[in-house]
């Protein structure tokens, strides 16, 4: 069998709402994946499990089942949404995200995704991790790849 390539493209949109009394931020983050099947037979994308972390705390999880079948030598773009909650333990974030004197309320989130594919009864898991900027101060739609967080401390490629 040839490889199945999973490429995390980035955040497509982030829709935000707030609970002022609970000092809680609700972010619905839609992400985009490209999955390429380099085989001469179809593969099934059985499930996608995703997790979002903020400051090493898991703030959201999602799981999609029986997603699609990708034909031979084909590629499919898949969107998946992770509902996230930045709760009161991080109530300082509520003030940051709602402060009108700040123009862009970008926070850095770690997106983790695992794609499980099956073919001929065989199962394969491919995982990706990526840091992304998300604006927690307003509803935002992104050009794909626009939200990527490039850590200046990373060694240059």
């Amino acid at each position: 069998p040839r490889s199945i390539d999973v490429k995390y493209i980035g955040v497509k949109s982030a829709y935000v709402s707030y609970d002022v009394q609970k000092r809680t931020i609700y972010l619905n983050i839609t992400n985009t994946l490209n999955i390429t099947n380099n085989n001469y037979y179809s593969v099934e994308v059985e499930n996608i499990t995703a997790q979002v972390q903020f400051s090493k705390t898991v703030i959201g999880k999602a799981r999609l089942n029986n997603i699609t079948i990708i034909g031979p030598l084909d590629m499919k773009q898949i969107d998946y949404t992770v509902p996230t909650v930045i709760a009161e333990e991080m109530s300082y974030m509520y003030d940051f995200c709602t402060l009108i004197s700040i123009k862009v309320h970008n926070i850095v989130l770690m997106m983790q995704v695992t794609v499980t594919t099956t073919y001929f009864g065989h199962s394969e898991q491919i995982s990706q991790e990526r840091y992304q900027y998300v604006d927690c101060g307003r509803n935002t739609t992104y050009q794909l790849g626009q939200s990527e967080y490039l850590n200046v401390l990373q060694p240059q490629q």
């Epitope: 609970d19 002022v20 009394q21 609970k22 000092r23 300082y92 003030d95 709602t98 402060l99």
Partner: antibody
Framework: QVTLKESGPGILQPSQTLSLTCSFS??????????VSWIRKPSGKGLEWLAH???????RYNLFLKSRLTVSKDTSSNQVFLMITSVDTTDTATYYC????????????WGQGTSLTVSS | QIILTQSPAIMSASLGEEITLTCSAS?????VHWYQQKSGASPKLLIY???NLASGVPSRFSGSGSGTFYSLTISSVEAEDAADYYC????????FGGGTKLEMK
């Protein structure tokens, strides 16, 4: 119109448990975003926030008193309750319940208060 | 826990005088609210969100501030303004300031 009214025992002995009731009208605590807090004022001192209950039964407590406090509600009878265990003389105060309106973080309506004296 | 420190603890004012009460936060917060409590009465909302006047509050009251420093100003004090004034924050672990007692000279 919105009204809140507190009721309590008036006098307790040290180590007893205080039970307070806040009866309200003019709003529903099942409405999304609503909340009710308990606040007290010891004579000659400032206001001290104690506990808050949200429309969805979520709760918050004063960090320093958390182990002694229990807040609860009965939505159908429009009542909020506060229990304080092991009272002592420092709990002598006027106790208020106050409403926090829908998606607000300030108290727009207050009860008249109920006085508690802890004495042996 | 955020500590709100109000000063002065007691203030004496003459009728018609402009006075300012201050509220200092131990950490930066987005805004504060102010309550007035007259003797023997319940607290009453005066100003919310640092500078917004609550319904029915006379325009001689105003609020300002940001970060760690907030203030309440009464432009021309009247006899009925004699009361305790409290600032309040709901940002991090909900606290009230210690209060300022306003007395008439």
């Amino acid at each position: 119109q919105v009204t809140l009214k507190e009721s309590g025992p008036g006098i307790l002995q040290p180590s007893q448990t205080l039970s307070l009731t806040c009866s309200f009208s003019g709003f529903s605590l099942s409405t999304s975003g609503m909340g009710v807090s308990w606040i007290r004022k010891p004579s000659g001192k400032g206001l001290e926030w104690l506990a808050h209950i949200f429309w969805d039964d979520d709760k918050r407590y004063n960090l320093f008193l958390k182990s002694r406090l229990t807040v609860s509600k009965d939505t159908s009878s429009n009542q909020v309750f506060l229990m304080i265990t092991s009272v002592d003389t420092t709990d002598t105060a006027t106790y208020y319940c106050a409403r926090m309106g829908r998606q607000r973080d300030y108290f727009d309506y207050w009860g008249q208060g109920t006085s508690l004296t802890v004495s042996s | 826990q955020i500590i709100l420190t109000q000063s002065p603890a007691i203030m004496s004012a003459s009728l018609g005088e402009e006075i300012t009460l201050t509220c200092s936060a131990s950490l930066s917060i987005s805004y504060v609210h102010w309550y007035q409590q007259k003797s023997g009465a319940s607290p009453k909302l005066l100003i919310y969100g640092t500078s917004n006047l609550a319904s029915g509050v006379p325009s001689r009251f105003s609020g300002s501030g940001s970060g760690t420093f907030y203030s309440l100003t009464i432009s021309s004090v009247e006899a009925e303004d004699a009361a305790d004034y409290y600032c309040h924050q709901w940002s991090i672990y909900r606290t009230f300031g210690g209060g300022t007692k306003l007395e008439m000279k």
